[in-house]
C-alpha cells in the first residue's frame, strides 16, 4: 500500500505575534498531504487545513476564542490521492505539537510611536494601540484591551546629540517626560509583559526624533 511512503510531521512550531497564530511543521510533502487538528486540554478536536500540501496552518480563528486557554495541535499525514488510507496501526500517522497558551506565549509585535508633542520642557509620547484579531462582541480588541495592566511600555529616549539612553515606563499608552529646553530628543518604545517568564519584550519601535514630521512643538 501507499502508506509506507507516508512520514509523520516533525518540528511542529507555533509562530504567533499579537495573537496571529500559525502552526508550522516539516517536511515539505512528497506524495502526501496534511490535516491539522486543534483542541483545548478539555475540548474536542477541530480539524483545519484539510488535506493541504502546505507546511503551515493558520489557527488564529481558533485560539482567539479564548487566548488564556492552553491549546494542543496535531498534524496528520495522509498519502496523496488516497486520504482514506491509514497507517499500519489503522490510524493515520500524526505528530503532536507542543502546548501553546496564547496569552503567555504570543510574541509582542513591534510597537509604533503614534505621536509626540512638546509643551515647554515636557514631552507627551503616545504609543499606537495596535488592533489584534481577538474579538469581543463582534469588535476587534486592541493589545491594551487584551492584556490590560499586564502590558507596559518602556520608552527609551535620548538627546539627538548623544547616545546614552534614559527610560520611562507606563501601563497606559502615553508617557509624559521631562526634557531639556532647546534640545532635540529621539524616542523608541518597547512593549513588555513583566508577568511572563519568556517572550517578555517586543522588538523596539522605529526611532522617532523631534524635528521630524510625527511630532508637534509648542513653546510655552
Amino acid at each position: 500500500s501507499g502508506t509506507t511512503n507516508t512520514v509523520a510531521a516533525y518540528n511542529l512550531t507555533w509562530k504567533s505575534t499579537n495573537f496571529k497564530t500559525i502552526l508550522e511543521w516539516e517536511p515539505k510533502p512528497v506524495n502526501q498531504v496534511y490535516t491539522v487538528q486543534i483542541s483545548t486540554k478539555s475540548g474536542d478536536w477541530k480539524s483545519k487545513c484539510f488535506y493541504t500540501t502546505d507546511t503551515e496552518c493558520d489557527l488564529t480563528d481558533e485560539i482567539v476564542k479564548d487566548v488564556k486557554q492552553t491549546y494542543l495541535a496535531r498534524v496528520f499525514s495522509y498519502p496523496a490521492g488516497n486520504v482514506e488510507s491509514t497507517g499500519s496501526a489503522g490510524e493515520p500517522l500524526y505528530e503532536n505539537s507542543p502546548e501553546f497558551t496564547p496569552y503567555l506565549e504570543t510574541n509582542l509585535g513591534q510597537p509604533t510611536i503614534q505621536s509626540f508633542e512638546q509643551v515647554g520642557t515636557k514631552v507627551n509620547v503616545t504609543v499606537e494601540d495596535e488592533r489584534t484579531l481577538v474579538r469581543r462582541n463582534n469588535t476587534f480588541l486592541s493589545l491594551r484591551d487584551v492584556f490590560g495592566k499586564d502590558l507596559i511600555y518602556t520608552l527609551y529616549y535620548w538627546k539627538s546629540s548623544s547616545s546614552g539612553k534614559k527610560t520611562a515606563k507606563t501601563n497606559t499608552n502615553e508617557f509624559l517626560i521631562d526634557v531639556d529646553k532647546g534640545e532635540n530628543y529621539c524616542f523608541s518604545v518597547q512593549a513588555v509583559i513583566p508577568s511572563r517568564t519568556v517572550n517578555r519584550k517586543s522588538t523596539d519601535s522605529p526611532v522617532e526624533c523631534m524635528g521630524q514630521e510625527k511630532g508637534e512643538f509648542r513653546e510655552i
Epitope: 507596559i152 518602556t154 534614559k166 501601563n171 518597547q190 513588555v192 519568556v198 522588538t203
Partner: antibody, heavy 121, light 107 residues
C-alpha cells in the same frame, strides 16, 4: 538558581582601563535589564549605568559617561563594563544587578557578589 | 536628578524594638521606590519593591509604606540579623538614585 557573578576587578593605575564581567545563570539576560552599581569604600550606593541586552540600549551616570561602556553578549549570557580613563574616585566595589518590573515599578532582585576596583599609582 | 533624602543616617536600637526609616523624594516618584538591606562585605538584598510590596522570602516584620513623596521602611520587631545598613532607591526616572543609607546598630 539565579546567579550573577562579577569578575575582572583589580588594581589599575590612573588613566588605565579594566573590563568587568557579569556572568548570569538561571535566567536569560535578554529577558531582563542589567545595571551596574558601585560603592566606594565606606560610602553609599551609586548607579553607574544599565543595558537592555535585548536591544543593546545603554544609559550612564554623568560621572562615567564617555569613559565607561556597558555591553552584553547574549550568547554567553554575560554583561560587561568596560572602564577607560580610570580615576582615583572610581575606586569602589562594582556590582551588577538584575532589574525586573512589577507592573511599571522596577526593582533589582538579584545582585552579584561584587568585584573590587582600585585605581592607584 | 531626583534626590532621595534618607533619615536618620544611623540609629541604635535593641532587639525587639520597632524601627522606622524614612526617605523623602525631591519630586513625585509615584510608587517606584524599593528598599535594600546591606551587610558589611555583602551585596545589597531587596526587601521591599513598589513602595509597599514585600519581596519573596523577606520576613513579614519588614514593611513599607508611602505618603505622597515620603516613604517609610518599618521593622516591627528588630532581630539580631537585622543589624545592617538600609537604602531606599527610586526607579521613577533615569538616573535611578539611592538614599544615603541608614546604619542600624546595636544599642
Amino acid at each position: 538558581e539565579v546567579q550573577l557573578v562579577e569578575s575582572g576587578g583589580g588594581l589599575v593605575q590612573p588613566g588605565g582601563s579594566l573590563r568587568l564581567s557579569c556572568a548570569a545563570s538561571g535566567f536569560t539576560i535578554s529577558e531582563y535589564w542589567i545595571h551596574w552599581v558601585r560603592q566606594a569604600p565606606g560610602k553609599g550606593l551609586e548607579w553607574v549605568g544599565f543595558i537592555d541586552p535585548y536591544n543593546g540600549y545603554t544609559g550612564y551616570a554623568d560621572s562615567v559617561r564617555g569613559r565607561f561602556t556597558i555591553s552584553a553578549d547574549t550568547s554567553k549570557n554575560t554583561a560587561y563594563l568596560q572602564m577607560n580613563s580610570l580615576r582615583a574616585e572610581d575606586t569602589a566595589v562594582y556590582y551588577c544587578a538584575r532589574a525586573d518590573y512589577y507592573y511599571v515599578d522596577e526593582y533589582w532582585d538579584y545582585w552579584g557578589q561584587g568585584t573590587l576596583v582600585t585605581v592607584s599609582s | 536628578d531626583i534626590q532621595m533624602t534618607q533619615s536618620p543616617s544611623s540609629l541604635s536600637a535593641s532587639v525587639g524594638d520597632r524601627v522606622t526609616i524614612t526617605c523623602r523624594a525631591s519630586q513625585d516618584v509615584n510608587t517606584a521606590v524599593a528598599w535594600y538591606q546591606q551587610k558589611p562585605g555583602k551585596a545589597p538584598k531587596l526587601l521591599i519593591y513598589s513602595a509597599s510590596f514585600l519581596y519573596s522570602g523577606v520576613p513579614s516584620r519588614f514593611s513599607g509604606s508611602r505618603s505622597g513623596t515620603d516613604f517609610t521602611l518599618t521593622i516591627s520587631s528588630l532581630q539580631p540579623e537585622d543589624f545592617a545598613t538600609y537604602y531606599c532607591q527610586q526607579h521613577y526616572t533615569t538616573p535611578p538614585t539611592f538614599g544615603q543609607g541608614t546604619k542600624v546598630e546595636i544599642k
